[in-house]
Interface confidence: low
Amino acid sequence: QLTTESMPFNVAEGKEVLLLVHNLPQQLFGYSWYKGERVDGNRQIVGYAIGTQQATPGPANSGRETIYPNASLLIQNVTQNDTGFYTLQVIKSDLVNEEATGQFHVYPELPKPSISSNNSNPVEDKDAVAFTCEPETQDTTYLWWINNQSLPVSPRLQLSNGNRTLTLLSVTRNDTGPYECEIQNPVSANRSDPVTLNVTYGPDTPTISPSDTYYRPGANLSLSCYAASNPPAQYSWLINGTFQQSTQELFIPNITVNNSGSYTCHANNSVTGCNRTTVKTIIVTELSPVVAKPQIKASKTTVTGDKDSVNLTCSTNDTGISIRWFFKNQSLPSSERMKLSQGNTTLSINPVKREDAGTYWCEVFNPISKNQSDPIMLNVNYNALPQENGLSPG
């Protein structure tokens, strides 16, 4: 059976296509090609006579067609108008005609697309943005890429207009992009230049750094405020509710206790019209904000009841602190045999009794901090064991 095959079936505009003929009968007078699905003299492209090997152009000939002795037809520099069906008629020697129809599709070489946007400066959580891939062309697939990734599944992303339009519902600061669109047809593909969004947002709640609360007199106070914001936030400082200055940093040299108080950073975004504040308490004091762990020592850790005495000493390098003592979670002294001396650094027990055996520890503190020692174990016995002079806690 006579058949035709288009090579290729999908042709790029400006390229060529060969209508190849298979199973051509023997004993031929000639053949003709027609545009369309049937033989129509008004739409003849070319005729070919075997005897004379002469090709004769028909009414539908454009000058771009070449017919070969094997009946194949080459069409060069194809246009989209060439898309469609082509019919070959073979005139046999017995004057019985055979026909075969083939087709091909011409697609344009796609241009580099571009992205248009209805809003390139959206406000976070408020605006929607619609991107449109230009130009609109027939028989084209539209694809979108965000940050070089295919579109994530998200209820905030919607495709419409045959995927030519990508809408971001309620943009966030993470939606900056870049965005690219790609157009594809069976013969070509092209991707746009990337487009980024300038998402306006913030300010978020500001952060004041450093995080320190306590400062010593004479130190320099240097505070910095930051709030995520686009465009960048404008900052101002208030101390105890009184406006100080409109800067991101606040610097006060050689502070005194009078500089203690409440420090407020105010962040403002003039585009979104939003404001956020953070308050930080600063305390200027001679007292150590962190009291070191004290050390506890005993003159003896094993003593004879009703005979020996013992001295417990609480050591610390911190100044301006107070000391208190504990025995079995009770505050000391708890009897007349216990005496505190040297600003409570020493606890003396004289004489030691059976009920004094157990765990002792000391605690150092000031108005803003405290710390306690590791416990020490006091052993009391009533037989004549040798005394142990030791400093190690139990």
Epitope: T141, L143, Q149, S154, N174, D175, P186
Partner: antibody, heavy 120, light 113 residues
């Protein structure tokens, strides 16, 4: 209901060729990226190839690059895998898969597979 | 290319107990544009094709029981079966779904102890 039906598997000698087909139904075929994934007997899953909605973009695992060609005919709702220069290590169950949504993504729908055996 | 490493290779857990499978990728799967991790988990029972359980590292596919959960970010991910059922015996695979390469982990076989 999404359905993917692979065919074309069989026994082939090393160096030979085979063409797998995957007939799709139950969804708009031309809207989705499609893939081939294979699994050697008793082994794990291996992604083989990806093709974009229009067929203009393809990508391949290094192990098959230059030997296998993925293609599609949107008018026939069919995905193909042309396998040339086959090797013993290509012996596997070949699955046709579809993404959950139109772009390239995870594999939400799988066919039952077609077995390819490369042996002399 | 991204390499996905799963551990352990196999796991035996009593019915009703928790099963935990780990997956590590050779590069971050976190997409900073949308703060989503491009990782999926699949379940494959003998003689069947794989079934999608979880995508974006922690989003359950519709119809998947809530005893399956995914967690992790960047390069380290975990699939947890909170209370193992008999029908959960299968091989589990993690997969990077960053276009254009879709690499699978080597698989973890989960059995009943």
């Amino acid at each position: 209901e999404v359905q993917l039906l692979e065919s074309g598997g069989g026994l082939v000698q090393p160096g030979g060729s085979l063409r797998l087909s995957c007939a799709a139904s139950g969804f708009s075929f031309s809207d989705y990226y499609l893939y081939w994934v294979r699994q050697a007997p008793g082994k794990g899953l291996e992604w083989v190839a990806t093709i974009s909605v229009g067929g203009g973009q393809t990508s391949y695992a290094d192990s098959v690059k230059g030997r296998f060609t993925i293609s599609r005919d949107n008018s026939k709702n069919t995905l193909y895998l042309q396998m040339n220069s086959l090797r013993a290590e290509d012996t596997a169950m070949y699955y046709c898969t579809r993404a959950l949504y139109y772009g390239p993504a995870w594999f939400a729908y799988w066919g039952q597979g077609t077995l390819v055996t490369v042996s002399s | 290319d991204i390499v996905m490493t799963q551990s352990p290779d196999s796991l035996a857990v009593s019915l009703g107990e928790r099963a935990t499978i780990n997956c590590k990728s050779s590069q971050s799967l976190l997409n900073s544009a949308n703060q989503k991790n491009y990782l999926a988990w699949y379940q494959q029972k003998p003689g069947q094709p794989p079934k999608l359980l979880i995508y974006f590292a922690s989003t359950r596919e519709s119809g998947v029981p809530d005893r399956f959960s995914g967690s992790g970010s960047g390069t380290d991910f975990t699939l947890t079966i909170s209370s193992l059922q008999a029908e959960d015996v299968a091989v589990y695979y993690c997969q990077s779904h960053i276009y254009p390469n879709f690499t699978f982990g080597g698989g973890t076989k989960v059995e009943i102890k």
